[in-house]
């Protein structure tokens, strides 16, 4: 978990801080959204359960050329124990519904905030 705070992290980041930083970034995305996020790109919906971070990254990494979510993609890579590349779907067990990136971010944010409030940081 050493890279979760971005490139300037001085050392290991506590899991609670890493999760908080991810929540903050998603809040910023949703609050600063003026035009459709990522031009209305669609991504695979995910199950917000075990393996959620890798699944979220696998879904979002297929969105290219969207600077608004680049930091989120980097942060999610710190939560996912394996390397994820575009077109990889090992954690996306069910690929049957596509939703807009904006809705994906909102759903993910709600779930992460619940985990944070419950004290589930890992």
């Amino acid at each position: 978990l050493t890279c979760l705070g971005g490139f300037a992290s001085p050392g290991p980041v506590p899991p609670s801080t890493a999760l908080r930083e991810l929540i903050e970034e998603l809040v910023n995305i949703t609050q600063n959204q003026k035009a459709p996020l990522c031009n209305g790109s669609m991504v695979w919906s995910i199950n917000l359960t075990a393996g959620m971070y890798c699944a979220a990254l696998e879904s979002l990494i297929n969105v290219s050329g969207c600077s608004a979510i680049e930091k989120t993609q980097r942060m999610l890579s710190g939560f996912c124990p394996h390397k994820v590349s575009a077109g990889q779907f090992s954690s996306l067990h069910v690929r049957d519904t596509k939703i807009e990136v904006a809705q994906f971010v909102k759903d993910l944010l709600l779930h992460l905030k619940k985990l944070f409030r419950e004290g589930q940081f890992n």
């Epitope: 609670s16 801080t17 908080r20 929540i23 419950e118």
Partner: antibody, heavy 123, light 107 residues
Framework: EVTLRESGPGLVKPTQTLTLTCTLY??????????VDWIRQPPGKGLEWLAH???????RYNPALKSRLTISKDTSKNQVVLKLTSVDPVDTATYYC???????????????WGQGTLVTVSS | DIQMTQSPSSLSASVGDRVTISCRAS??????LNWYQQKPGKAPKLLIF???MKPRGVPSRFSGSGSGTDYTLTISSLQPEDIATYYC?????????FGGGTKVEIK
């Protein structure tokens, strides 16, 4: 207008269970992002956070008192109840309930407080 | 638990003076620092949240600053109605913890 009102027994005997009720006005604990905290303040001393409960029934406690505390809510009455078991004279304090909101970042800032209820633990 | 240390524990200043109260956390709290004002016999009132943000109705003479472990509450021009005890509180990590308070009096 947002208001919180605490009610309690005033006097409790050592070893008994203290039950405090916080009634909420002007907002509902069934609304997303709403939470209620309990804080206490011994006479002439500082503030100590005890517990909180969120709209979706997520509960958190101060580890130092966790084994003695239970927080719950009754959405139909718009009330939050705190129980503190095995009370001791050191639990003598003014007990406050306060509202917290998590609409954006989770600040854990208490923006509205009740007037407080003084509880004395004595035989 | 994160320890919050406030200084000074009390101060006396004249009306119109600039007053600063310090709060130090035992570890980085990432700006999750809130300030409360408690007047004698009353409940605390939220003055500042997230280091520098103000709820509606808080006078402009109150401001907050800081980062990492060190935070400051400033009253730019002390008024008689500012006689109170001021508490800092960290909201970064549970359990939530408060500073010991700073009692502000008028000279």
């Amino acid at each position: 207008e947002v208001t919180l009102r605490e009610s309690g027994p005033g006097l409790v005997k050592p070893t008994q269970t203290l039950t405090l009720t916080c009634t909420l006005y002007g907002f509902s604990l069934s609304t997303s992002d709403m939470g209620v905290d309990w804080i206490r303040q011994p006479p002439g001393k500082g503030l100590e956070w005890l517990a909180h409960i969120w709209w979706d029934d997520v509960k958190r406690y101060n580890p130092a008192l966790k084994s003695r505390l239970t927080i719950s809510k009754d959405t139909s009455k718009n009330q939050v109840v705190l129980k503190l078991t095995s009370v001791d004279p050191v639990d003598t304090a003014t007990y406050y309930c306060a509202r917290t909101v998590s609409s954006g970042y989770i600040y854990y800032a208490m923006d509205y407080w009740g007037q407080g209820t003084l509880v004395t633990v004595s035989s | 638990d994160i320890q919050m240390t406030q200084s000074p524990s009390s101060l006396s200043a004249s009306v119109g003076d600039r007053v600063t109260i310090s709060c130090r956390a035992s570890q980085d709290i990432r700006n999750y620092l809130n300030w409360y004002q408690q007047k004698p016999g009353k409940a605390p009132k939220l003055l500042i949240f997230y280091t520098s943000m103000k709820p509606r109705g808080v006078p402009s003479r109150f401001s907050g600053s800081g980062s990492g472990t060190d935070y400051t509450l400033t009253i730019s021009s002390l008024q008689p109605e500012d006689i109170a005890t001021y508490y800092c509180q960290q909201g970064n990590t549970l359990p939530l913890t408060f500073g010991g308070g700073t009692k502000v009096e008028i000279k």
